[in-house]
């Protein structure tokens, strides 16, 4: 007969490691006992457990509560054991010695490798502002054993750079994502993707980009000057801009205070029934924490009576 085991067994930190040891013998052969030992325990082997066909499992004091048999059904030729809650100190070699009847003793070794999955963290860079050059958007760090892989998933155009630092059997990896901020990036997701054999699936951490900007201001409402005549009701000017953070609006009149009855409602300037006194230069001032913009328009309220008078004068003059 012969022993079937694995050269290498890999387990994730905190999970249970199955240490395989199966005797494939001829019919009629029996396994009397299986002894498991840590084979690289410095001064000689350190016993883990003894699996006896008659008396069951005996676990050595050093591994009390940590070694079990796999759940039933059990094959009498299977000497595999479970090492519960694997820690990094469990990495190393293990030996199973199988006593059979009538074939005698067999032994096999395996190597246990413990994977330490990463706990990634994402750190946003400094505040992003439109007009900046290449700027750090975020950095992502993950440490594990073996080294994790750190990549970025995003629609945003940018460049990545990574650095890693190795310690014994583990590595810390940091990847940075740099970009040239533009308003189109605002609200876009930037996702750090960490891969590691100790993870069931890639770990993803998403950061939403916030790019400070302020668009040029413009004023709407004067498209048809003929509508701005004495007596007209509901006339209004609307200031158009956009920004991040959302901007605030302020209206002033360049050639004096706002006329009485004119209402300021955020980005909108509402007029009472128009009079010629509403003529003037109006300024919309848009600002956020990033910048400020101005747009000014000239309102010229037409007086039909005055116009007709002018026309008569013109006629008589000719």
């Amino acid at each position: 007969g012969e022993l079937e085991t694995s050269d290498v067994v890999t387990v994730v930190l905190g999970q249970d490691a199955k240490l395989p040891c199966f005797y494939r013998g001829d019919s009629g052969e029996q396994v009397g006992q299986v002894a498991w030992a840590r084979a690289d325990a410095g001064e000689g082997a350190q016993e883990l457990a003894l699996l006896h066909s008659k008396y069951g499992l005996h676990v050595s004091p050093a591994y009390e509560g940590r070694v079990e048999q796999p759940p039933p059904p059990r094959n009498p030729l299977d000497g595999s054991v479970l090492l519960r809650n694997a820690v990094q100190a469990d990495e190393g070699e293990y030996e199973c010695r199988v006593s059979t009847f009538p074939a005698g003793s067999f032994q096999a070794r395996l190597r246990l490798r413990v994977l330490v999955p990463p706990l990634p963290s994402l750190n946003p860079g400094p505040a992003l502002e439109e007009g900046q050059g290449l700027t750090l958007a975020a950095s992502c760090t993950a440490e594990g054993s073996p080294a994790p892989s750190v990549t970025w998933d995003t629609e945003v155009k940018g460049t990545t750079s990574s650095r890693s630092f190795k310690h014994s059997r583990s590595a810390a990896v940091t990847s940075e994502f740099h970009l040239v901020p533009s308003r189109s990036m605002n609200g876009q997701p930037l996702t750090c993707v960490v891969s590691h054999p100790g993870l069931l699936q890639d770990q993803r951490i998403t950061h939403i980009l916030h790019v400070s900007f302020l668009a040029e201001a413009s004023v709407r409402g004067l498209e048809d000057q003929n509508l701005w005549h004495v007596g007209r009701e509901g006339a209004m000017l609307k200031c158009l801009s956009e920004g991040q953070p959302p901007p605030s609006y302020n209206w002033t009149r360049l050639d004096g205070p706002l006329p009485s009855g004119v209402r300021v409602d955020g980005d909108t300037l509402g007029f009472p029934p128009l009079t010629t006194e509403h003529s003037g230069i109006y300024v919309c001032h848009v600002s956020n924490e990033f910048s400020s913009r101005d747009s000014q328009v000239t309102v010229d309220v037409l007086d039909p009576q005055e116009d007709s008078g002018k026309q008569v004068d013109l006629v008589s003059a000719s």
Partner: antibody, heavy 116, light 108 residues
């Protein structure tokens, strides 16, 4: 700094054995597995197996099982690879390498020539 | 065993150009278990990249690695004269450990 220094070139006759040494310095010898890799002239790299310097435990590639023996002497931080029943196609440079998952440090290599 | 296939076998480029070397694996390999080595004539291999994308100590940032699953790439930007050598990929996740057959990067 970490160093792996290997023994010098050897010429052997077919059927003989060769033993190559690899002396480690600059780190704790028993803390890292040592692997052996060989490279025939003009060919690629071929993994032969590893030894755990702490326990002396070994694992050999199937191709070399029964012909290769890896040992160590922790008192002088040295690993050994012995290959027996040499054939002409065993002519190669033999490297030792330290394992930190990947092979982060390598010996300079030992040329073994098998010729009658 | 996992077979690693590198392409092209030989790559002829001039200094200053960009080199792209491919390594395909016969089975999926966790990126944490893939490394790239550089070997110059008469020298031992030198670790360049581990964990598919992490530069080893003292490796210039013109070397970068990427990929996952069965497709991995080593990129060398702005080739320097000292970069002309043979490059090997390696998987160390399952036994036996295996290497690709190598890509020779030569001066055009």
């Amino acid at each position: 700094q970490v160093q792996l220094v290997q023994s010098g070139a050897q010429v052997k006759k077919p059927g003989a054995s060769v033993k190559v040494s690899c002396k480690a310095s600059g780190y704790t010898f028993t803390g890292y597995y040592i692997h052996w890799v060989r490279q025939a002239p003009g060919q690629g790299l071929e993994w032969m197996g590893w030894i755990n310097p702490n326990s002396g435990g070994t694992n050999y590639a199937q191709k070399f099982q029964g012909r290769v023996t890896m040992t160590r002497d922790t008192s002088i931080s040295t690993a050994y690879m012995e290959l027996s029943r040499l054939r002409s196609d065993d002519t190669a440079v033999y490297f030792c390498a330290r394992e930190d998952w990947d092979f982060d440090y390598w010996g300079q290599g030992t040329l073994v020539t098998v010729s009658s | 065993e996992i077979v690693l296939t590198q392409s092209p076998g030989t790559l002829s480029l001039s200094p200053g150009e960009r080199a792209t070397l491919s390594c395909r694996t016969s089975q999926s390999v966790s990126s944490s278990y893939l490394a790239w080595y550089q070997q110059k004539p008469g020298q031992a291999p030198r670790l360049l990249i581990y964990g598919a994308s992490n530069r080893a100590t003292d490796i210039p940032d013109r070397f970068s690695g990427s990929g996952s699953g069965t497709d991995f790439t080593l990129t060398i930007n702005r080739l320097e004269p000292e970069d002309f050598a043979v490059y090997y990929c390696q998987q160390y996740g399952s036994s036996p450990i295996t290497f690709g057959q190598g890509t020779r990067l030569e001066i055009k």
